[in-house]
Amino acid sequence: AGVFELQIHSFGPGPGPGAPRSPCSARLPCRLFFRVCLKPGLSEEAAESPCALGAALSARGPVYTEQPGAPAPDLPLPDGLLQVPFRDAWPGTFSFIIETWREELGDQIGGPAWSLLARVAGRRRLAAGGPWARDIQRAGAWELRFSYRARCEPPAVGTACTRLCRPRSAPSRCGPGLRPCAPLEDECEAPLVCRAGCSPEHGFCEQPGECRCLEGWTGPLCTVPVSTSSCLSPRGPSSATTGCLVPGPGPCDGNPCANGGSCSETPRSFECTCPRGFYGLRCEVSGVTCADGPCFNGGLCVGGADPDSAYICHCPPGFQGSNCEKRVDRCSLQPCRNGGLCLDLGHALRCRCRAGFAGPRCEHDLDDCAGRACANGGTCVEGGGAHRCSCALGFGGRDCRERADPCAARPCAHGGRCYAHFSGLVCACAPGYMGARCEFPVHPDGASALPAAPPGLRPGDPQRYL
């Protein structure tokens, strides 16, 4: 068990031309708040898939009113960290979504209005117990600067929070075969229940006798790096028994990427994701126009006739990045459904389907779904000889052709107001209520918990709200 912590440093206009308009005005003062959603692994999941590692909402920031004629500055932020507790092992690799929300405080009928200002997402490797990692992400003309870390909650320790520490039974030393728990030298490692020899750094167990590997490691004792190179990490020499030692600083420490580039570690070194107008290994090359041919791998360059205006690379299938410099490992996103085998042919993606399934992504069950298609990203589900569409968020009807209002079912309880946006819905709770759907009265016996229970209601009896 442990806690993922996110510290927002600044949210404001990014570098370059086209500064965004201030989200607040004298007529409509507003304040910001943030939502973070965490998912395990490196899969690029849909925005509406559950935040399996957890989610958190920040407090509201200070009220901000734009000064007329002034450029949009960095906006005032909420105090404190966003904390996402996790109950099981820290996965080591994770995906995140950070949303910046605006709460307008004008004279709206029915209370404040919410709107999504910016949304950034990424995938990272992170060991629990390590230092704060710094990051910069851009969404349109906005820039978000933040730091994050994962830390274990006692008695858990280790890079995955899977080793346990217990107070010493004897004051002088730990029991036979048990080591002191750094940095808690006054505590001892709990007796190991994993399979004998299971790597304490790269393996963990949830049942006695098993040895499950963290991402990037394999073998019965999780001592073999998945990478064919001798060492997964660029930080230290290879070791025959443990895979890699991890002393010294990481390649992204001190952020080697210039001009606002963001750094991510790779198995051998580091990689910079550069803002528009910059490229090179460390984003050090600037003043680029389309005449310089900045788009790689057949990317089409648009705009940027003079050094002051940004260019945009339109990448061909299979490539991404501001300069089309990154090859997309499209099979890592597991696009083939129903156990289909993914083949990345470079120019195209192919799915080799298992018997009984068909379609570009093996999404059609030939039994019930033959010849039937679900519109708007819906998937066909077989059932009792009749086809049924499981529709993507925001669509409904037999073939997912009808636009559905996610707020139509009145999902927000206790008088909460529902707001629809592209990644689902958000409930703005009435004062005194909390939760994704305002399900939780903060003080159910107090005046704010309306409606009150009828007289004589005992614990265990239902209270009905229409």
């Epitope: 939760g435 994704a436 399900e439």
Partner: nanobody
Framework: EVQLVESGGGLVQPGGSLTLSCVAS????????YGWYRRAPGKQRELVAG???????VYSDSVKGRFTISRDNAKNSVYLQMNSLRAEDTAVYYC?????????????WGQGTLVTVSS
Amino acid sequence: EVQLVESGGGLVQPGGSLTLSCVASGSPSSINAYGWYRRAPGKQRELVAGISSDGSKVYSDSVKGRFTISRDNAKNSVYLQMNSLRAEDTAVYYCYYFRTVSGSSMSYWGQGTLVTVSS
């Protein structure tokens, strides 16, 4: 309809840990939320932690980082893992269940389980 049964309360020393469990029997629905509330002597009942049907969680400021709420949909159960307990955590802890069926919402409460933190 829906009955809630809590367990796991008891006497524990400061700094210790306890896990509370709550099982919902009857006819729980898939669109639901579970929560844990507590009432300390002489105070009104307050929210401790809650978990929605989409898995999102809320915690009161006083327990953040110490308590963890989780649920097991297959067992219609919710759990509250309480670590680093303090004397001020002493209270009767109530399980809360909230569900929506056909646009109508209902909430249910358990009978409560006593947690005493004392040396």
